[in-house]
């Protein structure tokens, strides 16, 4: 079954996917597609990388993470209800049938007016299976869970901390990371 992630209409959604390159600069092509992973490739490709670069992308889809180190998590800007559905992250490891495929379910909720958020850091036990992203318009500040007003630099730091934590291990165990080499 797919791991589920949530975002609100008008905000940015984050779908995590990681791998560990065998060596610096020795990258593996990755594709992201809308719809479950087919036998080969990605259906309805929204973004693709090659050995070095993002070489195909469509509007609103991008990799915010350090993808040359294996963070190929997808950011979808300014989501709408139509963005709901299953997304495929495919790590295209050389060789026959070697690809690693991850299906991630994105649930988009209607935007709701909320009171000024508090600044608590409330990581629920469900974090690995529900990662909510919020922002203040496309390509601007994103926050994870209930962490308001954190800038992207802080998020990057937070993400690194999470990746080293048990929560991150749980997240990876749930099917969004692969070590190569």
């Amino acid at each position: 079954s797919e791991v589920e992630y949530r975002a609100e209409v008008g905000q940015n959604a984050y779908l995590p996917c990681f791998y560990t390159p065998a060596a610096p600069g020795n990258l593996v092509p990755v594709c992201w597609g809308k719809g479950a992973c087919p036998v080969f490739e990605c259906g309805n490709v929204v973004l693709r990388t090659d050995e070095r670069d993002v070489n195909y992308w469509t509007s609103r889809y991008w990799l915010n993470g350090d993808f040359r180190k294996g963070d190929v998590s997808l950011t979808i800007e300014n989501v709408t209800l139509a963005d709901s559905g299953i997304y495929c992250c495919r790590i295209q490891i050389p060789g026959i049938m070697n690809d690693e495929k991850f299906n991630l379910k994105l649930v988009i909720k209607p935007a709701k007016v909320t009171p000024a958020p508090t600044r608590q850091r409330d990581f629920t036990a469900a974090f690995p299976r529900m990662l909510t992203t919020r922002g203040h318009g496309p390509a601007e500040t994103q926050t994870l869970g209930s962490l308001p007003d954190i800038n992207l630099t802080q998020i990057s730091t937070l993400a690194n901390e999470l990746r080293d934590s048990r929560l991150a291990n749980d997240l990876r165990d749930s099917g969004a990371t692969i070590r190569i080499g």
Epitope: T20, P24, R52, V54, T153
Partner: antibody
Framework: EVQLVQSGAEVKKPGASVKVSCKAS????????MHWVRQAPGQGLEWMGW????????KYSQKFQGRVTITRDTSASTAYMELSSLRSEDTAVYYC???????????????????WGQGTMVTVSS | EIVLTQSPGTLSLSPGERATLSCRAS???????LAWYQQKPGQAPRLLIY???SRATGIPDRFSGSGSGTDFTLTISRLEPEDFAVYYC?????????FGGGTKVEIK
């Protein structure tokens, strides 16, 4: 000392080809990417393409696709950029630049163009 | 391709002043792989900042980079005489790699 030394200035006629060389020293040539960037007189910088000096893979900007060929000679630690069907608009300084790929434990996975050649002036004139 | 727009085109300042240069991308820069270069007449560009905010080797700490997504800034905290030059931003995550049009920092 890490450095890139390019070949000398060239004057070519429209329709001709030019091949510029870039000799690397002071580092392991095959561990890096080499890019080519050009700059027309008084203008900005324009990326042309890269070569993975290790495996020879290349990528070119769509603008130059079909006219540019980037190669390398690992035994000579040298990269080459050949541009064909020259026209007057190709008059520019052509630079090679190394793309430093950092080890995984560094903060960022890529270091941009950290070392540049001195540039090669190519003049296209009839 | 990602278009990078730099502003202002020219910045006229005196030594000791603070310089703030802007680079705006038409789309988000993947990996935040954005670099800043300095170029002086007759010379090759010199890498100042990579990954939007990391200083390259040997670059004085008066140079700092910030930003993410589509908006990036290069700040020179106190201009030295040798800092008057043209500055370019570049995104190097999505092909084709692209450069901004440059900002000239000149002596007032």
């Amino acid at each position: 000392e890490v450095q890139l030394v390019q070949s000398g200035a060239e004057v070519k006629k429209p329709g001709a080809s030019v091949k510029v060389s870039c000799k690397a020293s002071g580092y392991t040539f095959t561990s890096y990417y080499m890019h080519w960037v050009r700059q027309a007189p008084g203008q900005g910088l324009e990326w042309m393409g890269w070569i993975n000096a290790g495996n020879g893979n290349t990528k070119y900007s769509q603008k130059f696709q079909g006219r540019v060929t980037i190669t390398r000679d690992t035994s000579a630690s040298t990269a080459y950029m050949e541009l064909s069907s020259l026209r007057s608009e190709d008059t520019a300084v052509y630079y090679c630049a190394r793309d430093h790929v950092l080890p995984l434990y560094y903060g960022s996975g890529s270091y941009a163009f950290d070392i540049w050649g001195q540039g090669t002036m190519v003049t296209v004139s009839s | 391709e990602i278009v990078l727009t730099q502003s202002p085109g020219t910045l006229s300042l005196s030594p000791g002043e603070r310089a703030t240069l802007s680079c705006r991308a038409s789309q988000s820069v993947s990996g935040n792989y954005l670099a800043w270069y300095q170029q002086k007449p007759g010379q090759a560009p010199r890498l100042l900042i990579y990954g939007a905010s990391s200083r390259a080797t040997g670059i004085p700490d008066r140079f700092s980079g910030s930003g993410s997504g589509t908006d990036f800034t290069l700040t020179i905290s106190r201009l030295e005489p040798e800092d008057f030059a043209v500055y370019y931003c570049q995104q190097y995550g999505s092909s084709p790699y692209t450069f901004g049009g440059g900002t000239k920092v000149e002596i007032k």
